[in-house]
């Protein structure tokens, strides 16, 4: 998260750290007791490694009573996700067992009504991704409030040049932005999960390259079918 600040500890009980061989790889969001939603590209480099999900965490390194690391029983990338595109960049991870819920671990309601979030709406994005242009990774969860950007602006030739389909949404990226390591994390508007940070290799913090988020409402049928 660029230009953000440290989050209030455990105030986002839906927040997950998707980990590879014990190290933070991507963000994720608890959407059901046994399911975490993340980004499909996050697993591209994970073929030989052990993928786990950390819930109830604020600090990645410090002991916390609510922290628990879960093994992954099943990883379900969206069937249409591809390495070279940002489209359909969703991944569902089934935990080895139902998460122990409490004040610091709680699923987040997700948007099912397939309607664009109004431009200018302030949404919260959180993650353990890099926090500056040097590439420093934080130990504690960071967050930032970002205004939603209308699709027409985001699709300008100077911005994302038509790449933003109706199944994607954008948020402003002028110095405040999601970045490397935040992929798969939640974009929350009005207490509801609206988007998932895409994991394309995008310049961060540049106003001309807005953040791109996968609209979960557009994938409601797929999410429901996997969770069923």
């Amino acid at each position: 998260i660029l230009g953000g600040r440290e989050a209030e500890a455990h105030a986002r009980p839906y927040m997950a750290s998707v980990q590879l061989n014990g190290a933070h790889l991507c963000g994720g969001v608890l959407v059901a007791e046994q399911w975490v939603l993340s980004a499909a590209h996050c697993l591209e480099d994970a073929a030989d490694g052990k993928v786990q999900v950390l819930l109830g965490a604020h600090s990645l390194s410090q002991p916390e009573p609510s922290k628990r690391l879960y093994d992954v029983l099943r990883a379900v990338p969206h069937p249409d996700s591809q390495p070279d595109t940002i489209d359909h960049d969703l991944l569902l991870l089934q935990l080895s067992e139902k998460a122990t819920l409490g004040p610091a671990v709680r699923p987040l309601p997700w948007q099912r009504v397939d309607r664009d979030v109004a431009p200018g709406t302030l949404c919260d994005v959180a993650g353990w991704g890099i926090v500056n242009h040097a590439g420093r990774r934080p130990d504690s969860l960071q967050h930032v409030l970002l205004p939603v950007l209308d699709r027409a602006t985001c699709n300008r030739a100077t911005h994302h040049d038509g790449a933003i389909t109706e199944r994607l949404m954008c948020a402003e990226s002028n110095r405040r932005d999601s970045c490397k390591g935040d992929s798969g994390g939640p974009l929350v508007c009005g207490g509801v999960l609206e988007g998932v940070v895409t994991s394309g290799s995008r310049v961060c913090g540049n106003a001309k390259k807005p953040g791109i988020y996968t609209r979960v409402a557009s994938y409601a049928a797929w999410i429901d079918s996997v969770l069923a």
């Epitope: 242009h133 590439g135 420093r136 990774r137």
Partner: antibody, heavy 113, light 106 residues
Framework: EVQLQQSGAELVKPGASVRLSCTAS????????MHWVSQRPERGLEWIGK????????KYDPKFQGKATITADTSSNTVYLQLSSLTSEDTAVYYC??????WGQGTSVTVSS | QSVLTQSPAIMSASPGEKVTMTCSAN?????MYWYQQRPGSSPRLLIY???NLASGVPVRFSGSGSGTSYSLTISRMEAEDAATYYC?????????FGGGTKLEIK
């Protein structure tokens, strides 16, 4: 544990080029930015530039533009610094860094005929 | 480009003494990093984002400042702190380092 292993010292002739390597272990270079910094006794520490290994995007200090080229090979978790048209002014120790936090041991480059 | 001037260039301190060195920028910068370099070694990150201690750095080190004026303080000098200290700014490209403060032990 994060480690950056740099290639060995180089003695090169004026006008030649040299390519230094830095192999990372303990993390995937695609998940951060990698930097190169030079150190000369009379000039101190100077930031040369950085690369985003995930997409190859680079940014340089203008004074090193044309002199330095930073590349990355994600399959071997290695970043490279190529220095061209070398002069005695380029004699220095060159460090690679992960996120400006973890430094390699440095590679000494001496330009001499 | 942002020019960073460190002062003093050389200083010495006795064990247990408090040490403060400064880094002045010719234009306002938002954050400062500090590095320690012992003779024959690579630099090591001490302080990031002006005042945050890097992993494994003793709590006797602290950083502060804003705008054009930043400082690094060692609350009680120890022999192993004899080194050269560099500041670095991240606000504007190109990122620049100060010329260093060499700290010797008395």
């Amino acid at each position: 544990e994060v480690q950056l292993q740099q290639s060995g010292a180089e003695l090169v002739k004026p006008g030649a080029s040299v390519r230094l390597s830095c192999t990372a272990s303990g993390f995937n270079i695609k998940h951060t930015y990698m930097h190169w910094v030079s150190q000369r006794p009379e000039r101190g520490l100077e930031w040369i530039g950085k690369i985003d290994p995930a997409n190859g995007n680079t940014k340089y200090d203008p004074k090193f533009q044309g002199k330095a080229t930073i590349t990355a090979d994600t399959s071997s978790n290695t970043v490279y610094l190529q220095l061209s048209s070398l002069t005695s002014e380029d004699t220095a120790v060159y460090y690679c860094l992960n996120a400006m936090e973890y430094w390699g041991q440095g590679t000494s480059v001496t330009v001499s005929s | 480009q942002s020019v960073l001037t460190q002062s003093p260039a050389i200083m010495s301190a006795s064990p247990g003494e408090k040490v403060t060195m400064t880094c002045s920028a010719n234009s306002s910068v938002s954050d400062m990093y500090w590095y320690q370099q012992r003779p024959g070694s690579s630099p090591r990150l001490l302080i990031y984002d002006t005042s945050n201690l890097a992993s494994g750095v003793p709590v006797r080190f602290s950083g502060s400042g804003s705008g054009t004026s930043y400082s690094l303080t060692i609350s009680r000098m120890e022999a192993e702190d004899a080194a050269t200290y560099y500041c670095q700014q991240w606000s504007t490209y190109p990122w620049t380092f100060g010329g260093g403060t060499k700290l010797e032990i008395k």
